[in-house]
């Protein structure tokens, strides 16, 4: 096969008739050492994805289903492109599975026992895989059958497609289950009239279905929808209150040497020439053989995916979750409103340690996962692989875009009892240079610079942020000749000052001795110009404080503080000599287990939080020598965020907007996946 | 510093039976948490399991109803005994009292655990 041919997978004779057309196309429009199509023919999807990974074909557009299947192992393939709707400028690759309830009545998601249901259709995604895998483990057992077990569960329903002789109750509703437009409660405006006219209680679903059928806004205020965290929100909201975001249709690859650039390329080339509006001899989203051959015909054009989402991140937890429901057929053996143990993100070894100890000391109450990037942990806590960790304000702002919440904050002033009902102003975010320097914040161009991790708040947003208003460009490594900023690329000059050891040289995490705040400040005393970092690290980390050897014998006077205006001051001052006010450190979870880790942490943190006097014998949850594993070691307790419980209320306006700003300059992979 | 001496390891066959001791030096260990730890080739070092000073224990999935974690505050020991051994468990075992390994990483030299007919 040559190395730029991309091997199409066609799953019947039309698409294979198309995919010839498309390469013959292909061929006299790309030149000759661009990318070329090949075409493979199976007998259906999962021929197809068997073939993909055993490298007899390179790609294949899936529903997202099909996306779940060829995500499991052994198969390990990947999203590469999507397929968008809607116009250029506002390019729709997910639609949102909805539950529609009219706004007088007054049950929530967990209230739907009893109640009567609307659904697109047997076997549909919106309207019966999504809601019923995800209220399958509420439903009575035997689970098997699944028609009868819903059946019993609502008091009446309308499921076009179902069998109506062996399962009454799903055709109560809409007498035959006819599986055609002659039943007027069939698909999704079916399933919405049928709610609208007062048969069932609940519809199941997209979230489009109530725009398309009133157009109205006051006709549209008369409907709400069920959230999964048993609130309601209005029908605008259905991007923080849905069931689950399903990807619409999406090209798949191997994970590993799975041509994605290439296949990118060549999407993205057919479509500048045969895309909507483009071509008349032949058109990519449309065919005289038949509907939606090898890519949907309502489709207007691709998306690359960006690299760092897996088939998990794109297709979602609430998606994953329904499917592996339905699928597995498995329920945990606790009631599902009883808390299960709580899983931590641990970064590296360092922490895994400290995890392991408080898990044995909490009686499995905790239990650890670990990653080697603090993006990494937040993944795995949006996949469901772990449950939560405590953040730096810059990763709180990319775990909320990735839809996690805040939980508890890290009080570090606050002394107890009121501490853990008190919200803080936050840390001060500074800059440490050594007395004996003439630095000054304006003459900093040049310099060593020494930094917690990039994204992280005191370490790099604000600092950055300042000096991008100042320098209108991205190149921070330019603009100081050297430095160390964990996370930064392998190449950077902002690598070069890392201590490592070596595999482990600018990784953001604690293998990199000059990462975090303790970190920096190592830099600054044993190479660098500036460090930045929060307030307190200076005093934690001097006058023997600090038992470390290069540590142990450090004096606060020798370092100062840079203020803003040019001056400079004593770091006893940071009030009147700092950089910004940072928001505290806290702990984010996923939604669906925000209740659950905030009750286990305040449980945890009266066993072992700052109460404990003898940290040598004792398990102490926020000590670990001035390392800050898994929490800030000033950390005196964790405190109830109130009303402040979304990541923008959290982070505060001024924050938030600085980050947004620094998104121009930002390397994070996460955030643009989570942002896709 | 605390020493800590892992011994007990050997061959033994599958569905045998090992009992591994850790013995620390200092009074220390009777006041903290210990734990033993395993490492197979090629694998992250892994908690197998923990004892608190008050005795309470966590055991990790793969070893439960299988293996005891117990220890001894007099002899500043701790035991970990392996009942019905599959060959997924050889490793070589280490223990830890966890009372610098947060920021020093220190371990000792370990005992081989090998599971084989």
């Known amino acids: 096969v040559p190395e730029k041919s991309v091997r199409w997978c066609a799953v019947s004779e039309h698409e294979a008739t198309k995919c010839q057309s498309f390469r013959d196309h292909m061929k006299s429009v790309l030149p000759s050492n661009g990318p070329s199509v090949a075409c493979v023919k199976k007998a259906s999807h999962l021929d197809c994805i068997r073939a993909i990974a055993a490298n007899e074909a390179d790609a294949v557009t899936l529903d997202a289903g099909l996306v779940y299947d060829a995500y499991l192992a052994p198969n390990n393939l990947k999203p590469v492109v999507a397929e968008f709707y809607g116009s250029k400028e506002d390019p729709q690759t997910f639609y949102y599975a909805v539950a529609v309830v009219k706004k007088d009545s007054d049950f929530q998601m967990n209230q739907l026992r009893g109640r009567k249901s609307c659904h697109t259709g047997l076997g549909r995604s919106a309207g019966w895989n999504i809601p019923i895998g995800l209220l399958y483990c509420d439903l009575p057992e035997p689970r098997k059958p699944l028609e009868k077990a819903v059946a019993n569960f609502f008091s009446g329903s309308c499921v076009p497609c179902a069998d109506g002789t062996d399962f009454p109750q799903l055709c109560q509703l809409c007498p035959g289950c006819g599986c055609s437009t002659l039943n007027q409660y069939f698909s999704y405006s079916g399933a919405f009239k049928c709610l609208k006219d007062g048969a069932g209680d609940v519809a199941f679903v997209k979230h489009s279905t109530i725009f398309e059928n009133l157009a109205n806004k006051a006709d549209r205020d008369q409907y709400e929808l069920l959230c999964l965290d048993n609130t309601r929100k209005s029908v605008d909201e259905y991007k923080d209150c849905h069931l689950a975001r399903v990807p619409s249709h999406t090209v798949v690859a191997r994970s590993v040497g799975g041509k994605e650039d290439l296949i990118w390329e060549l999407l993205n080339q057919a479509q500048e020439h045969f895309g909507k509006d483009k071509s008349k001899e032949f058109q990519l989203f449309s065919s005289p053989h038949g509907k939606d051959l090898l890519f949907k015909d309502s489709a207007h054009g691709f998306l690359k995916v960006p690299p760092r989402m897996d088939a998990k991140m794109y297709l979602g937890y609430e998606y994953i979750t329904a499917i592996r429901n339905l699928r597995e057929g498995t329920c945990p053996e606790a009631p599902t409103d009883e808390c299960k143990p709580v899983k931590w993100c641990a970064l590296s070894h360092h922490e895994r340690l400290k995890c392991d100890e408080w898990s044995v000391n909490s009686a499995g109450k905790i239990e650890c996962e670990s990653a080697e990037t603090t993006e990494d942990c937040i993944a795995k806590i949006m996949n469901g692989e772990a449950d939560a960790m405590s953040l730096d304000g810059g990763f709180v702002y990319i775990a909320g875009m990735c839809g996690l919440v805040p939980v508890l904050a890290e009080n570090y002033n606050t002394p107890n009892p009121n501490c853990e009902n008190t919200a803080e102003e936050g840390y001060f975010a500074v800059a440490v240079v050594k007395s004996s320097s003439d630095l000054t914040w304006d003459n900093l161009k040049g310099k060593k610079s020494c930094h917690t991790a990039v994204g992280r708040t005191a370490g790099w947003n604000i600092p950055m942020g300042l000096l991008y208003s100042k320098i209108n460009h991205c190149r921070f490594d330019e603009f100081f000749s050297e430095g160390c900023a964990p996370g930064s690329e392998k190449n950077s000059s902002l690598c070069k000052l890392c201590m490592g050891p070596s595999p482990n040289l600018c990784e953001p995490n604690n293998k990199e001795g000059y990462y975090g705040y303790t970190g920096a400040f190592r830099c600054l005393v044993e190479k660098g110009d500036v460090a930045f970092v929060k307030h307190q690290t200076v005093p934690q980390n001097t006058g023997g404080k600090n038992p470390d050897a290069w540590a142990k014998n450090l004096k606060e006077e020798d370092y100062e503080l840079l203020c803003l205006d040019g001056s400079r001051k004593s770091v006893q001052e940071p009030a009147n000599c700092h950089l910004a006010r940072a928001p505290n450190h806290a702990v984010v979870a996923r939604k669906d287990k925000a209740d659950c880790v905030q009750t286990l942490l305040l449980d945890q943190q009266r066993m072992f939080g700052s109460s404990v006097t003898d940290c040598s014998s004792n398990f102490c949850l926020f000590e670990s020598k001035t390392k800050d594993l898994l929490f800030r070691d000033d950390t005196v307790c964790l405190a109830k965020l109130h009303d402040r419980n979304t990541y923008e209320k959290y982070l505060g306006e001024e924050y938030v907007k600085a980050v947004t700003n620094l998104r121009k300059c930002s390397t994070s992979p996460l955030l643009e996946a989570c942002t896709f | 510093q605390v020493q800590l001496v892992e011994s007990g390891g050997g061959l033994v066959q599958p569905g045998g039976s090992l009992r591994l001791s850790c013995a620390a030096s200092g009074s220390i260990a009777s006041i903290n948490t210990m734990a033993w730890y395993r490492q197979a080739p090629g694998k992250q070092r892994e908690l197998v399991a923990g004892?608190?000073?008050?005795?309470?224990?966590k055991y990790a999935d793969s070893v439960k109803g299988r293996f005891t974690i117990s220890r001894d505050n007099a002899k500043n020991t701790v035991y970990l005994q392996m009942n019905n051994l599959k060959p997924e468990d050889t490793a070589i075992y280490y223990c830890?009292?966890?009372?610098?390994?947060?920021?020093?990483?220190?371990w000792g030299q370990g005992t081989q655990v090998t599971v084989s007919s």
């Open positions: 830890t009292d966890y009372s610098k390994r947060y920021y020093q990483d220190y």
């Open positions: 004892i608190t000073s008050g005795g309470s224990t």
